[in-house]
Structure formats: C-alpha cells, structure tokens
C-alpha cells in the first residue's frame, strides 16, 4: 500500500523564501516516520528531512547547499527554504517514509513542485548626459 | 538462497575506527520489502541492535550509538556497511548482519558474524 | 527504550520434557492486533536464528514443537518436547519500536 502525496505543481519565488507542504494520505502521528524533499528530476539531493512520530516534534536538518526547517500536523508536512538563489529553481519531490511500527509505508512519487526563484534585478536610473 | 556474509573484523586499537561489510546475495539490497540491519554481540553478552537501513537508502540508529555509527550501501556491489568511530574496550564484539522483512522487521536471515577486539 | 525482561535467566532440563519461556516487555508492542515480537535461538559460535515471527507464527523450515503465545506484554516461547539439539540460548526481540531491543537471554542446559 502506498501513500498519496499532494504538492502544489509551481511555487514561484521572488522573496528567496518559500514554503512547501506535502499533504498526505496517512494519519502523520499513527506512526514514526522521516520526511524529506528532495531536489531534482531524479531527487538527487535529499535536501530537507526531518524525522518525528506521535511524541514529540522533529527536528529538520538541510543539505549544506540549503537553509531548511519544517513543522507537520496530522496529515501535512511543511518544509520552509530560505536563502534560495537562482540556481535553486527546479523540481522538488516531497517524500515520507513511515518505519515504526511496522509495516514500513512509503509514498507513491507525486509530480513534484517546481519551484521557480525569480532573478533580482536591480534598477539603475541612468542620468542624461548635461550638455 | 539468501546469504549474508560480513568481513572486515579484527584487532583494532581503542581510539580508532571500524568499517565492515556485509555481502548480500539472494536478493538486492535495493528493492522494496527488505532492508538489512546490523546487531552486535559483546563476548557472553546479550545482542545489541544498532541500526538499520531499508530500500530507499534511510538508515535509522541505535540512540546509545547514534554519534559514532554509519550504515551506508554500494547497491552496485550488493554490499553494505558499518562504520563504527572512536573504539572503546566495550565495542568488542561479534558484529553480525542481518535482513528483515517489511512486515514484522522480524530477522529472518542473518550472517556469520565478524569478530571485532578493540585493546591495545 | 521498551524493555524486555526474559524468565528464567537459565533453566535445566531433559530431553522430551516440556519448556516454557517467557518475555515481558515494558509496554505493549501490540499495533493493530499484531503483536511485534519475535523469538531467535543461538547455539555457542554460531548466529542466532529466527524460530517465531510476530509472537505466534512459525518461521519456515523450524519444527512443529516450537509454539509462541501471548499479546501485549507478555509473551510466552514453549518447546513440547525438548530435543538434544533444542540446547541453546533463546531470545526475544521486539520490533514495534525504535530502537530495536532484545531480552537478555534464556540458556536451556541439560539436566
């Protein structure tokens, strides 16, 4: 039996801060789990993941490419990303795996959130030439 | 046939580090339903789980050892891992692997065990 | 960490007898009517080996007189009639929670 996952398909980002939820099919606090996003069409880089259960909130650690922390309730996971750059623009795939107790419970790969980090363009005001 | 096979054990010096393997055949370490974990057994002594990896490649540890341990696998090879830092006198042990199943996470094949003796 | 306290610690016995075994965790390690508890036994110098998954259900390949019983917290591993080569350490695992724990032992030595 796999899980169902639901993630918004594009987030677009010009304040280099977002937040992502995986909204799942699954009662969070029946059992242990770890959640993790991963980045990349083949979820390449684990770039978030935290691990909790029914007893106590999880303490989310990140990739040292990325600033990440993360909260649930019962049926979501929100991951938050901040100091993103435009080189962070891709697909990011929300992953949960329940372990304990058994039997162990996977999610079934969703379309993935393409999240878009907008380039800042800084305006300079060019000043005619005084003749 | 499933077989487990661990190698890697020996005299190492208090201080020091641990890396042993474990063969796998009979069935890939990769595909969903198994993972394989890793118990130990000091001289006379009861068994100790230390950790776990399924899969997907997530691992899970022992508390008590979590600081010093890393389970890690090379799907290419079928092969897993233990890396096992900082020995101490009380790390002496029979080191075995062994597969679960999904289901119950019961133990239903293990190794032969590899002989670690951690003094100087 | 659940605890699992196994008794006897060790027991003497003779071939054809009876023998019972039981664990006693430190909290249910039941989850939706199935009990994660596990029994194993290990001769001297070998590994150990899988005799009763989920407290009740023969492994493949073990003999008929091995039987497992109980829910909850306690659990009981009987042996009908003790066979010469059923000498050996016994064990109980449970795996309902992280981190995996094993009772201490029950050694099984003729009598």
């Known amino acids: 039996n796999k899980i169902l996952v639901k993630q918004s398909p594009l987030l677009v980002v010009d304040s280099n801060e977002v937040s992502l939820s995986c909204r799942y099919s699954y009662n969070l606090l029946a059992k242990e789990f770890r959640a993790s996003l991963y980045k990349g069409v083949n979820s390449d880089v684990e770039v978030c993941v935290g691990n909790g259960n029914f007893t106590y909130q999880p303490q989310f650690r990140s990739n040292a490419e990325f600033n990440c922390d993360g909260d649930f309730d019962n049926e979501t996971v929100t991951f938050r990303l901040w100091n993103l750059h435009v080189n962070h623009t891709d697909i990011y795939f929300c992953k949960i795996e329940f372990m304990y107790p058994p039997p162990y419970l996977d999610n079934e790969r969703s379309n993935g959130t393409i999240i878009h980090i907008k380039e800042k363009h800084l305006c300079h005001t060019q000043s005619s030439p005084k003749l | 046939e499933v077989q487990l096979v661990e190698s890697g054990g020996g005299l190492v010096q208090p201080g020091g580090s641990l890396r042993l393997s474990c063969a796998a055949s009979g069935f890939s370490l990769s595909t969903s339903g198994v993972g394989v974990g890793w118990i130990r057994q000091a001289p006379g002594k009861g068994l100790e789980w230390i950790g776990e990896?399924?899969?997907?490649?997530?691992?899970y540890y022992n508390p008590s050892l979590k600081s010093r341990v890393t389970i890690s696998r090379d799907n290419s090879k079928n092969t897993l891992y233990l890396q096992l830092n900082s020995l101490r006198a009380e790390d002496t042990a029979v080191y075995y692997c062994a597969r679960y199943k999904y289901d119950y996470y019961d133990f239903d094949y293990w190794g032969q065990g590899t002989l670690v003796t951690v003094s100087s | 960490d659940i605890q699992l306290t196994q008794s006897p610690s060790s027991l003497s016995a003779s071939v054809g007898d009876r023998v019972t075994i039981t664990c006693r965790a430190s909290?249910?390690?039941?989850?939706?009517?199935?009990?994660?508890l596990h029994w194993y036994q290990q001769k001297p110098g070998k590994a150990p080996k899988l005799l009763i998954y989920?407290?009740?259900s023969l492994q493949s390949g073990v003999p008929s007189r091995f039987s497992g019983s109980g829910s909850g917290t306690d659990f009981t591993l009987t042996i009908s009639s003790l066979q010469p080569e059923d000498f050996a350490t016994y064990y109980c695992q449970q795996s309902y929670r992280s981190p995996r724990t094993f009772g201490q032992g029950t050694k099984v030595e003729i009598k």
């Open positions: 909290q249910s390690v039941d989850f939706h009517g199935i009990s994660f």
């Open positions: 989920a407290a009740s």
């Open positions: 990896i399924y899969h997907s490649g997530s691992t």
